[in-house]
Amino acid sequence: LEETLLNTKLETADLKWVTFPQVDGQWEELSGLDEEQHSVRTYEVCDVQRAPGQAHWLRTGWVPRRGAVHVYATLRFTMLECLSLPRAGRSCKETFTVFYYESDADTATALTPAWMENPYIKVDTVAAEHLTRKRPGAEATGKVNVKTLRLGPLSKAGFYLAFQDQGACMALLSLHLFYKKCAQLTVNLTRFPETVPRELVVPVAGSCVVDAVPAPGPSPSLYCREDGQWAEQPVTGCSCAPGFEAAEGNTKCRACAQGTFKPLSGEGSCQPCPANSHSNTIGSAVCQCRVGYFRARTDPRGAPCTTPPSAPRSVVSRLNGSSLHLEWSAPLESGGREDLTYALRCRECRPGGSCAPCGGDLTFDPGPRDLVEPWVVVRGLRPDFTYTFEVTALNGVSSLATGPVPFEPVNVTTDREVPPAVSDIRVTRSSPSSLSLAWAVPRAPSGAVLDYEVKYHEKGAEGPSSVRFLKTSENRAELRGLKRGASYLVQVRARSEAGYGPFGQEHHSQTQLDESEGWREQLA
């Protein structure tokens, strides 16, 4: 990018540059027309018969450098060929010299600084590539010369440019003074400011465009070259903030439209809101959940919104004495989540009718809550109690919902208490083929013992076909048809109106080897 400091083509008024010395044959200002018929100013000089050592100087007005360290001067000029000039002497030249002088203010006068090299700094002696030929009575013909010179380094507030003629017949058609700067550039969402290079290359720190944030790594920077070009180099740039996406060739961040979101900074575009969520404003980093829908704390910001599940279905209970097996079907609605668990709430009602939450004597296997399988075994039920179990399904957002948690209830009433296990079995008589047994009457909490069941089998014969049962209404029994000299394992259980109690411990007894021994009492 070029920034103009002076362009005589754009000057509509007299330039009125300073000439030295005040003699005939000096530089003179002329006006003409450019291609658009606009008035332009030029200077010409043609003192080809000048006195030896006589120079004609022309100095521009003071030009503020505006921070430029190097300034470029593009000269357009024509130069008359010395041979075309009939009165040209040996002093005729086809070159001129360019100088500059720096100052902090417009302090030059008609006589100062002294019109010579040092204090003026020589830039170059300019020779014409194209010479203009002029024949008497005919129009001059020849190309315009264009020369660009580089001034500097400059350090003061401004400068003057000066032209020294030592015998040329020439016209300075235009002067363009400019400096080069790197234009403002936006790349990778990073804005690099307009920069005037002060050296061969200058590092320039970038800043993120609006609604962008720095990417991890070093701060973005680019190099501005002396020629006003940005050095090509990968830029660790910026990325759009959450709720914004890159647009217009990675030069700006655009807010996500309504109904879309972008949860993280970085690359990527705005996405439609996930299920059961919405964004009513632009620039959303997260979509709000619909009423009744939630995100768990551990859910990503871009996750769909979910809802607690409905109640489990079809609870089936199987009561077995003091233990209960419950199982159920999964809820119809999972709420859109995979982290489904079940929990049970329990109330118990005594036979008299008073109810309360279940006591601590119940055990749940695998547990009363955080169940991942749809079943549980409850142990330690008390007889003749009514239990109400509420089975609820839960997921990761159940804790965020307000209002009652849906459940599936099941009522179970336990039987009255069965007699306790029968122990202390005694062998009252034994023979080679029979055993007479007796036991103490157990104390049945719910009514009298109605009868007993004796279960026995020969020791070593463990299969179900070898087990035999005998019922008796008395607290004694005779086992017949036994093997001579064999060992038998015996268990007894009692039955009341509440049902059978559990079998007692196995009792070990043995038949006689010989008849002649007779019956004899055996104590267990």
């Epitope: 008024a13 007299d14 009125k16 005040q22 003179e28 200002e29 002329l30 006006s31 003409g32 027309l33 018929q37 606009h38 008035s39 030029t42 010409e44 043609c46 024509t78 008359l80 203009t132 002029k134 009575g137 129009e139 001059a140 017949c169 016209a171």
Partner: antibody, heavy 126, light 108 residues
Framework: QVQLVESGGGLVQPGGSLRLSCAAS????????MSWVRQAPGKGLEWVSA????????SYADSVKGRFTISRDNSKNTLYLQMNSLRAEDTAVYYC???????????????????WGQGTLVTVSS | DIELTQPPSVSVAPGQTARISCSGD??????VHWYQQKPGQAPVLVIY???KRPSGIPERFSGSNSGNTATLTISGTQAEDEADYYC???????????FGGGTKLTVL
């Protein structure tokens, strides 16, 4: 001899037309930018119009724009001023004047008038 | 457009210095040229580019220009210098020229 000689002046009625001529001699006419300057009786000088060396650019004072036309015939070394819709206030001596010439580039001229004709009187009256 | 203002008349005794002013906004930034016109004659250029003298013009004629005022100075004024003097500069439009109202110099 370097000189400019105007002709074509005279008495003309308001609304009428007149064509002034200026014959140049003694210099390369086709390298010179030319102008017309007028002077009302007892008044000061007033620039009227200008034309560049090749004749393709013209410029006019606001007071005559649209009524006067400047032109030139370089083959005849002659400058013209065609005056139409003349008014009483156009009554003046009309001078043909040369702008200072470039050494060799007829695209440019100096801003002063370095050569004048003797003038021709135009009287607009009924 | 720029307006150039001159005093209608200036009087000077022979041999004295006559100064004729020409004023206008920021006139010092423009080149000013001066013309002499004697009765019944065409104008003659006496000073151009503020202070340059054409060949044939006596050295007693000089010019200056700064600020808002340009000045034509005739030192050692002679009777033959009695005439009307006009200043001229660029106008605002493209290649339009402006003249001052003129000053009648009387040599007493």
């Amino acid at each position: 001899q370097v000189q400019l000689v105007e002709s074509g002046g005279g008495l003309v009625q308001p609304g009428g037309s007149l064509r002034l001529s200026c014959a140049a001699s003694g210099f390369t006419f086709n390298n010179a930018w030319m102008s017309w300057v007028r002077q009302a009786p007892g008044k000061g000088l007033e620039w009227v119009s200008a034309i560049n060396a090749k004749g393709q650019f013209t410029s006019y004072a606001d007071s005559v724009k649209g009524r006067f036309t400047i032109s030139r015939d370089n083959s005849k070394n002659t400058l013209y001023l065609q005056m139409n819709s003349l008014r009483a206030e156009d009554t003046a001596v009309y001078y043909c004047a040369r702008k200072g010439m470039s050494f060799y580039n007829n695209k440019y001229a100096k801003s002063m008038f370095d050569l004048w004709g003797q003038g021709t009187l135009v009287t607009v009256s009924s | 457009d720029i307006e150039l203002t001159q005093p209608p008349s200036v009087s000077v005794a022979p041999g004295q210095t006559a100064r004729i002013s020409c004023s206008g906004d920021n006139l010092g930034k423009k080149y000013v040229h001066w013309y002499q016109q004697k009765p019944g004659q065409a104008p003659v250029l006496v000073i151009y580019y503020d202070s340059k003298r054409p060949s044939g013009i006596p050295e007693r004629f000089s010019g200056s220009n700064s600020g808002n005022t340009a000045t034509l100075t005739i030192s050692g004024t002679q009777a033959e210098d009695e005439a009307d003097y006009y200043c001229q500069a660029w106008g605002a439009g493209s290649h339009q020229m402006v003249f001052g109202g003129g000053t009648k110099l009387t040599v007493l």
